[in-house]
Interface confidence: low
């Protein structure tokens, strides 16, 4: 277990013609704030990837209002490190984004407003317990320097992390098979400390931890015998003992989820759904507090009333969940009125008018005949705060544009065939068939499958589609 | 090429509403400040307001009890509305786009509409 | 409000003269400046903004510069099409002001 840290140093303009322009003023004060995301190898994710090793967010620095005439210095920055706890082993090789976010402090509706205003991003190799490395990023014209370190949280010590140390119970030597803890030459290197609970005969761990069960074991804590019927289980290998399948390890077996959490398998690898208070890739991190940015897309962090809630994420719209992991489907509350059609584009949620509407939630009703023609001799029609064309014979659609033929569609079922009429089709059907398109058989007693009739229509009248 | 299209009546009489919409053709709508700006027969040009694609928007204090501006980003356009006209608001109305946090460019106007309010 | 006093309010010149139009802000705003031209019927046009930018598409012989709270648009050499109406505006604050308006006539 340990932790990874970073310390911004500055945020500002980089080198170079075309500098930026500050993105504070009196007419725009605003505020930075830091989000770090980080996972385990070299990969080239997509930045809206899992942040497997974990993410933070730092506290909003000063709020900044630039002085006329200054030049555009580097920015207020917020103080203390990101960090970011990861319980298992320090991977070695990881990659990193950065992002600088600015929080307007206008007279905003609704609120300050956040936008992202640059995105850094590496793939860096780190050996726990070095030094501070120092880096320079660019994100267009901004230049952002910073350092970053991993470092193991006692008793664990190494390169990854993974090796336990223990103060020597003698002075002379360290247990049977165990090592002195270099440069710790007064600790001892301890046994790895499996999950509590783990069958000391049937499981075993290679990180402090872990519970892994040997052959034939199953379980959290390899307790249960795996039985007979995973003869019918369809995957693993064929056991050369048995003759029959044992099932090979699944990405829920021994449920790797901790603190609670629960386990779900996903195509590649398994999802841990945590309690409050837990986080992490395994609900591995615990006592967590909004200096540990356990907010993540972008969710606004407030200190929870009593120690069992220790933070509350406020969650932006489109993301919900503990910690504002889970993206909702925002279009599933119906925002979009008067029959708007909803997008919901993950930046943002927009609704798309149907005619005779507008506003961001087609709110608004538009007296939508005023500027407005209707093309081929249609007429305006207002009502109910739609726009609608009245066309003349032989034209439809919105605008009357469009040469209409209520035939083309084949609209009459079962071999009935079609006449276009002055106010829309008339449908002749075969014998045996009835209805506005010859959709109902007539039964051979005389009766037909029509509902019934609506007043002054008789079922074997031929009928209009309007 | 960006191009501002605005539209909306151009005779109103006194205490009627007035209302105008700017649609936006060949750019991205968000990052950048949508403005109305009016400039009375003969006279200078005055700044009404501005909003930006999150509705977040700002106000002449001159006209603030009076005037809305609203946004749909679906259509990717922008309206103004002025309550109470008076003959003082007889004017050439122009939408402009203005770049976010890059300094004084409106880079983008519309053709104008003249609105005339007489009894 | 900041108010942006331009002067002169109108001027006569003749082609290939160098022309100076002045603002000056009620207080410290930045380079939060922009030149328009305005021609009669027509909207306005973006000609330099963040005081000293050049937009794309204008002729170099636009230049703005800036001391303190007074900004100057400088025409080098005045051709036939420069005669026109001009105004500045400031953006460093709300509400934003334009100048009352330069009118650059033929002499």
């Known amino acids: 277990a340990g932790v990874f840290e970073l310390q911004i140093h500055s945020f500002g303009p980089g080198p170079g013609p075309g500098a930026p322009r500050s993105p504070c003023s009196a007419r725009l004060p605003c505020r930075l704030f830091f989000r770090v995301c980080l996972k385990p190898g070299l990969s080239e994710e997509a930045a809206e990837s899992p942040c497997a090793l974990g993410a933070a967010l730092s506290a909003r620095g000063p709020v900044y209002t630039e002085q006329p005439g200054a030049p555009a210095p580097d920015l207020p920055l917020p103080d203390g490190l990101l960090q970011v706890p990861f319980r298992d082993a320090w991977p070695g090789t990881f990659s990193f984004i950065i992002e600088t976010w600015r929080e307007e402090l206008g007279d905003q509706i609704g609120g300050p407003a956040w936008s992202l205003l640059a995105r850094v991003a590496g793939r860096r190799r780190l050996a726990a317990g070095g030094p501070w490395a120092r880096d320079i990023q660019r994100a267009g014209a901004w230049e952002l320097r910073f350092s970053y370190r991993a470092r193991c949280e006692p008793p664990a010590v190494g390169t990854a992390c993974t090796r336990l140390c223990r103060p020597r119970s003698a002075p002379s030597r360290c247990g049977p098979g165990l090592r002195p803890c270099a440069p710790l030459e007064d600790e001892c290197e301890a046994p790895l400390v499996c999950r509590a609970g783990c069958s000391p005969e049937h499981g075993f761990c290679e990180q402090p931890g872990e519970c892994r069960c040997l052959e034939g074991w199953t379980g959290p804590l390899c307790t249960v015998p795996v039985s007979t019927s995973s003869c019918l289980s369809p995957r693993g290998p064929s056991s050369a003992t048995t003759g029959c399948l044992v099932p090979g390890p699944g990405p829920c077996d021994g449920n790797p989820c901790a603190n609670g959490g629960s386990c779900s398998e996903t195509p590649r690898s398994f999802e841990c759904t945590c309690p409050r208070g837990f986080y992490g890739l395994r609900c591995e991190v615990s006592g967590v507090t909004c200096a540990d940015g356990p907010c993540f897309n972008g969710g606004l962090c407030v200190g929870g009333a009593d120690p069992d809630s220790a933070y509350i994420c406020h969650c932006p719209p489109g993301f919900q969940g503990s910690n504002c992991e889970k993206r909702v489907d925002r279009c599933s509350l119906q925002p979009c009125r008067n029959g708007g059609l909803c997008l919901d584009l993950g930046h943002a949620l927009r609704c798309r008018c149907r005619a005779g509407f507008a506003g961001p939630r087609c709110e608004h009703d538009l007296d939508d005949c005023a500027g407005r023609a209707c093309a081929n001799g249609g007429t305006c029609v207002e009502g109910g705060g739609a726009h609608r064309c009245s066309c003349a014979l032989g034209f439809g659609g919105r605008d009357c544009r469009e040469r209409a033929d209520p035939c083309a569609a084949r609209p009459c079922a079962h071999g009935g065939r079609c006449y276009a009429h002055f106010s829309g089709l008339v449908c002749a059907c075969a014998p045996g068939y009835m209805g506005a398109r010859c959709e109902f058989p007539v039964h051979p007693d005389g009766a037909s499958a029509l509902p019934a009739a609506p007043p002054g229509l008789r079922p074997g009248d031929p009928q209009r589609y309007l | 090429q960006v191009q501002l299209q605005q539209w909306g009546a151009g005779l109103l009489k006194p205490s009627e509403t007035l209302s105008l919409t700017c649609a936006v053709y060949?750019?991205?709508?968000?990052?950048?400040?949508w403005s109305w700006i009016r400039q009375p027969p003969g006279k200078g040009l005055e700044w009404i307001g501005e909003i930006i694609h999150s509705g977040s928007s700002n106000y002449n204090p001159s006209l603030k009890s009076r005037v809305s501006i609203s946004v749909d980003t679906s259509k990717n356009q922008f309206s103004l509305k002025l309550s109470s006209v008076t003959a003082a608001d007889t004017a050439v109305y122009y939408c402009?786009?203005?770049?976010?946090?890059?300094?004084?460019?409106?880079?983008?106007w519309g053709q104008g509409t003249l609105v005339t309010v007489s009894s | 409000a900041i108010q942006m006093t331009q002067s002169p309010s109108s001027l006569s010149a003749s082609v290939g003269d160098r022309v100076a139009i002045t603002c000056r802000a009620s207080q410290g705003i930045r380079d939060d400046l922009g030149w328009y031209q305005q021609k009669p019927g027509k909207a306005p046009k973006l000609l330099i903004y963040?005081?000293?930018s050049l937009q794309s598409g204008v002729p170099s012989r636009f230049s703005g510069s800036r001391s303190d709270t007074d900004f100057t648009l400088t025409i080098s050499s005045l051709q036939p099409e420069d005669f026109a109406t001009y105004y500045c505006?400031?953006?460093?604050?709300?509400?934003?002001?334009f100048g009352g308006g330069t009118k650059v006539e033929i002499k």
């Open positions: 963040a005081a000293s």
């Open positions: 505006l400031q953006d460093y604050d709300y509400p934003l002001t």
């Open positions: 060949g750019g991205s709508f968000s990052g950048y400040y």
């Open positions: 402009s786009r203005g770049e976010y946090g890059s300094g004084s460019r409106f880079d983008y």
